[in-house]
Amino acid sequence: THLGIRLPLRSGLAGPPLGLRLPRETDEESEEPGRRGSFVEMVDNLRGKSGQGYYVEMTVGSPPQTLNILVDTGSSNFAVGAAPHPFLHRYYQRQLSSTYRDLRKGVYVPYTQGKWEGELGTDLVSIPHGPNVTVRANIAAITESDKFFINGSNWEGILGLAYAEIARPDDSLEPFFDSLVKQTHIPNIFSLQLCGAGFPLNQTEALASVGGSMIIGGIDHSLYTGRLWYTPIRREWYYEVIIVRVEINGQDLKMDCKEYNYDKSIVDSGTTNLRLPKKVFEAAVKSIKAASSTEKFPDGFWLGEQLVCWQAGTTPWNIFPVISLYLMGEVTNQSFRITILPQQYLRPVEDVATSQDDCYKFAVSQSSTGTVMGAVIMEGFYVVFDRARKRIGFAVSACHVHDEFRTAAVEGPFVTADMEDCGYNIPQTDESTLMTGRA
């Protein structure tokens, strides 16, 4: 779940620059499960640094040990550093917890690049800036890792919020959120507002920056504008959805919609980029290049490797197109579209730029494991993971970065036929042969 450009990620400030926020519209969505309205104690409970992940503060054990934990909707294990590591300021010390129980079972999670391994146990877990509950949850105590922890990232573990099917070592290991819902009266829903910086942060700003909000048990209406549009969760493993159409500046890529979901499409807060299947990526880049053809950028920029730098404050956002993904709607033959701006898919990079420059990486990249709607997408939207009703909601984020000419958008409905045909059916093989993580 943590490989290549899956991590690191980026975070930033809670609000757009210059106070640019969209006006609220009246809500049109049907009744939401769980508590509605204000979750003030959970707002702004995420932090993060550019390219290195959004994390929430959690406590484990008795007495409580405080750790920062990466929020990852693309995996299903709660795993924390439990041994000294050069990149960890602190780690979970099981021997100091009176409530720790050893499950006497190991877990090994290899990635395309890197791995972590550890020992399974359970302990008491709570989220200080979350619901006022304590639950007994499975914990993988990471004893050895390679290319997993990130120097300076400020997180010491990972909270996998996806379903049991992709938990390691197998689906019998109950994920944290399942335990939380089972042991409390908290509704089976959470929502994420990830707030990208939109500009490079220096070391001091990055450490102090607010990254966004994880609302556990419901929806906070202050975190979005307009209405929420829902797409079905196709299958409960990853948060799998179906994309039915892709447009660049309103121009349809005109591909067989199966290509957009080959071999799946997932919503993953633990991935930095918008990752697209090879054919789709090539078509999208060709279209983005054509839309911005008054300029030519180096080949390495389109590979997500080279940075392009502009004089501070002069980034020509207008020459870059918007990207629209149409998602299957809840009603037959109905879809809706989410539209992101270059302010989302050009990722500001700190440390490289001088005070005279703003430097960016192209944050759309190629995937061999399907579409991954990572932070590049999520930073434009308030995303509701409505597990109770097996659906994911999107609304325009109150903190998304935009300019005076364009904003991110969630719009619908659109008539789209035969959407079921857009889903790819993975040939049934031994699941143990499926690649761990997303290359």
Epitope: K296, D299, Q306, L307
Partner: antibody, heavy 120, light 108 residues
Framework: QLQLQESGPGLVKPSETLSLTCTVS??????????WGWIRQPPGKGLEWIGM???????WYNPSLRSRVTISVDTSKNQFSLKLSSVTAADTAVYYC????????????WGRGTLVTVSS | EIVLTQSPATLSLSPGERATLSCRAS??????LAWYQQKPGQAPRLLIY???KRATGIPARFSGSGSGTDFTLTISSLEPEDFAVYYC??????????FGGGTKVEIK
Amino acid sequence: QLQLQESGPGLVKPSETLSLTCTVSGGSISSSSYYWGWIRQPPGKGLEWIGMIYYSGSTWYNPSLRSRVTISVDTSKNQFSLKLSSVTAADTAVYYCARVGHGVSYFDLWGRGTLVTVSS
Amino acid sequence: EIVLTQSPATLSLSPGERATLSCRASQSVSSYLAWYQQKPGQAPRLLIYDASKRATGIPARFSGSGSGTDFTLTISSLEPEDFAVYYCQQVYTWPPRTFGGGTKVEIK
């Protein structure tokens, strides 16, 4: 084969504007594969990038010179030009024009250079 | 801003000897680094790009290696025409404006 040739006055007075032209022969300046750039080298010193231009007219400048530099392109003449205003003795250098190729990242073809002296 | 530091400033060698020139970046530039050769009174010439790819017409005795922050230009056996000044340039950040200070390879 493609060649680049700088031309312009070799002597410019302080506070005046330095003007140079680079003529591209053996190929089209309107190729979508290249930028066209200017680099200078003060006597006995290293290389300093001044700026570059795309055939569409899109320009990129060195921040330290941005306020004084203008680069323009004339596709009909297959030429691009450099203007550097308010020159001082510190602008005395050999000025090179070059093609930016290999994924528009590297200076893969250079003119021979022309020495411009700033003196009264 | 990324700074490129070349060492040594001067390298005194005899024809036939192996020359090893270093270029160090103040932070990672991945493999986006080039080497140029400049002979007295001439324009620079691109030798190596993307850290290790030889430009068109460059003899095989020139090779580049490295990635991240440490890069090396190696001339396996110096020919008389190889005595010149060598510059590195990073293009990890674009536009391509950062050059190293140069290494002079002179006859011993």
